[in-house]
C-alpha cells in the first residue's frame, strides 16, 4: 500500500526569535504530506499546517497565548493523495518535538539603538523597545513588557580612535554614560537575560557612532 513509503519526520527543531516561533523538520516530502499538532503539557492537541508539503510550521499564534508554558509538538506523515490512510499500527506515523518553553528559550532578536544624545560629558543612549507578537488585551507587547526586569541590555562603547570596549548595563532601555569631552564614541548593545542558562545573549546591534545622523550633540 501507499503507506509503506511514508517516512516519519525527524530532526524536529524549534526556531524562535522574540517569540516568533517556527517548528522545522526533515525530510523534504516525497509522495507524502505533513500535519503538525501542538499542545501544552496538560492541554489538548491542536492541529496546524494541515497536509502541508512544507517542512516548517509557524506556531507563533499558539505559543504566544502563554509564553511561560512548556509546549510539545508532533509532526504526522500521511501518503500524498491518501491522507485518510494510516500506518501499520492503525494510525499515521508521527514524531515528537523536543519540549519548548518560549520564555526560557526564544532567542533574543538583534536590538537596535534608537538614539543617543550628548549633553556635555554625558551621553544618553536609548535602545528601541522591540514589539513582539505576544498580545495582552488585543495589544502587542514589547520585549520589555514581556520580560520586565529579567531583560537587561549591555552597552559596549568605545572611542572611535581606540578598540577597547567599555561596558555599561541597564534594566531599562536607557543608558547614561560618562564620556571624554571632544571625543567621538561608537556604541553597540546586546540584550541579555541573566537568569537563563542558555540563549542568554542576543547578537549585537549595528554599531552607531557619534557624528552620524542618529545622535544629537548639545554643548552645555
Amino acid at each position: 500500500s501507499g503507506t509503506t513509503n511514508t517516512v516519519a519526520a525527524y530532526n524536529l527543531t524549534w526556531k524562535s526569535t522574540n517569540f516568533k516561533t517556527i517548528l522545522e523538520w526533515e525530510p523534504k516530502p516525497v509522495n507524502q504530506v505533513y500535519t503538525v499538532q501542538i499542545s501544552t503539557k496538560s492541554g489538548d492537541w491542536k492541529s496546524k499546517c494541515f497536509y502541508t508539503t512544507d517542512t516548517e510550521c509557524d506556531l507563533t499564534d499558539e505559543i504566544v497565548k502563554d509564553v511561560k508554558q512548556t509546549y510539545l509538538a508532533r509532526v504526522f506523515s500521511y501518503p500524498a493523495g491518501n491522507v485518510e490512510s494510516t500506518g501499520s499500527a492503525g494510525e499515521p506515523l508521527y514524531e515528537n518535538s523536543p519540549e519548548f518553553t518560549p520564555y526560557l528559550e526564544t532567542n533574543l532578536g538583534q536590538p537596535t539603538i534608537q538614539s543617543f544624545e550628548q549633553v556635555g560629558t554625558k551621553v544618553n543612549v536609548t535602545v528601541e523597545d522591540e514589539r513582539t507578537l505576544v498580545r495582552r488585551n488585543n495589544t502587542f507587547l514589547s520585549l520589555r513588557d514581556v520580560f520586565g526586569k529579567d531583560l537587561i541590555y549591555t552597552l559596549y562603547y568605545w572611542k572611535s580612535s581606540s578598540s577597547g570596549k567599555k561596558t555599561a548595563k541597564t534594566n531599562t532601555n536607557e543608558f547614561l554614560i560618562d564620556v571624554d569631552k571632544g571625543e567621538n564614541y561608537c556604541f553597540s548593545v546586546q540584550a541579555v537575560i541573566p537568569s537563563r542558562t542558555v540563549n542568554r545573549k542576543s547578537t549585537d546591534s549595528p554599531v552607531e557612532c557619534m557624528g552620524q545622523e542618529k545622535g544629537e550633540f548639545r554643548e552645555i
Epitope: 559596549y156 570596549k165 561596558t167 555599561a168 545573549k201
Partner: antibody, heavy 120, light 107 residues
C-alpha cells in the same frame, strides 16, 4: 558544576611571552563574560581585562594595554591570555573568572589560579 | 577610573566578635559593589553582591550595606573559618576596581 581551570603559568624572562589558558566546564563561555584578574605575591587583586566570547569584544587595564591580549575559542570553551613584553611587575598569580552578566552579580566563579614569575 | 578605598587594611579580632569593614567609592557606583573572601593560596569567593545581597551558600552572619558611596561588610559573629582577607569591588563602570583588601587576623 561550574569550573574554571587555568594553565600555562611558569617562569619567563623579562621581555618574554607566555600564553595562559582558562578551560571552562559546566557552562558555555559564549553565554557569559570572562575576566582575568591577577595578584602579585602578598598584594591585592588587580583586574587585567575581559572578553565577551560571543562577539570578541575586549577591554584591558592600562597597566597591560598593548602587551596583553585576551581571546577565546568557543569551540573549545576556553579563554586565553597572551602576555608579551613581560616585566618583573607582571609576576603574579593569574585568575580567570566568570562574569554572571547581570546588573547585580558580577564575578561569581573563579579558577584556582596559575603563577607567572618574570625573572632573569 | 573609580577608586575603592578600603579600611582598615588589617584588624585583629576574636571568635564571636562583630567585625566591620568599609569601602568608599571615589564616585557614585549605585549598588554595583561586591565583597569577596580570600584565604591564603586560594581563589577569592563571592560573599555579597549588589551591595547587600547574600550570595547563595554564604552564611547569614555576613551582611552588606550601602550609604551613598560608602559600603560596609559586617560579620556579626566571627567564626574560626572567617579569618581571611576581604576585598570590595565595584563593577559600575569599566574598568572594575578592587579595594586594597582587609586582612582579618586572630587576636
Amino acid at each position: 558544576e561550574v569550573q574554571l581551570v587555568e594553565s600555562g603559568g611558569g617562569l619567563v624572562q623579562p621581555g618574554g611571552s607566555l600564553r595562559l589558558s582558562c578551560a571552562a566546564s559546566g557552562f558555555t563561555i559564549s553565554d557569559y563574560w570572562i575576566h582575568w584578574v591577577r595578584q602579585a605575591p602578598g598584594k591585592g587583586l588587580e583586574w587585567v581585562g575581559y572578553i565577551d566570547p560571543y562577539n570578541g569584544f575586549t577591554y584591558y587595564a592600562d597597566s597591560v594595554k598593548g602587551r596583553f591580549t585576551i581571546s577565546a575559542d568557543t569551540s573549545k570553551n576556553t579563554a586565553y591570555l597572551q602576555m608579551n613584553s613581560l616585566r618583573a611587575e607582571d609576576t603574579a598569580v593569574y585568575y580567570c573568572a566568570r562574569d554572571y552578566g547581570s546588573l547585580q552579580v558580577f564575578i561569581d566563579y573563579w579558577g584556582q589560579g596559575t603563577l607567572v614569575t618574570v625573572s632573569s | 577610573d573609580i577608586q575603592m578605598t578600603q579600611s582598615p587594611s588589617s584588624l585583629s579580632a576574636s571568635v564571636g566578635d562583630r567585625v566591620t569593614i568599609t569601602c568608599r567609592a571615589s564616585q557614585d557606583v549605585n549598588t554595583a559593589v561586591a565583597w569577596y573572601q580570600q584565604k591564603p593560596g586560594k581563589a577569592p569567593k563571592l560573599l555579597i553582591y549588589s551591595a547587600s545581597f547574600l550570595y547563595s551558600g554564604v552564611p547569614s552572619r555576613f551582611s552588606g550595606s550601602r550609604s551613598g558611596t560608602d559600603f560596609t561588610l559586617t560579620i556579626s559573629s566571627l567564626q574560626p573559618e572567617d579569618f581571611a582577607t576581604y576585598y570590595c569591588q565595584q563593577h559600575y563602570t569599566t574598568p572594575p576596581t578592587f579595594g586594597q583588601g582587609t586582612k582579618v587576623e586572630i587576636k
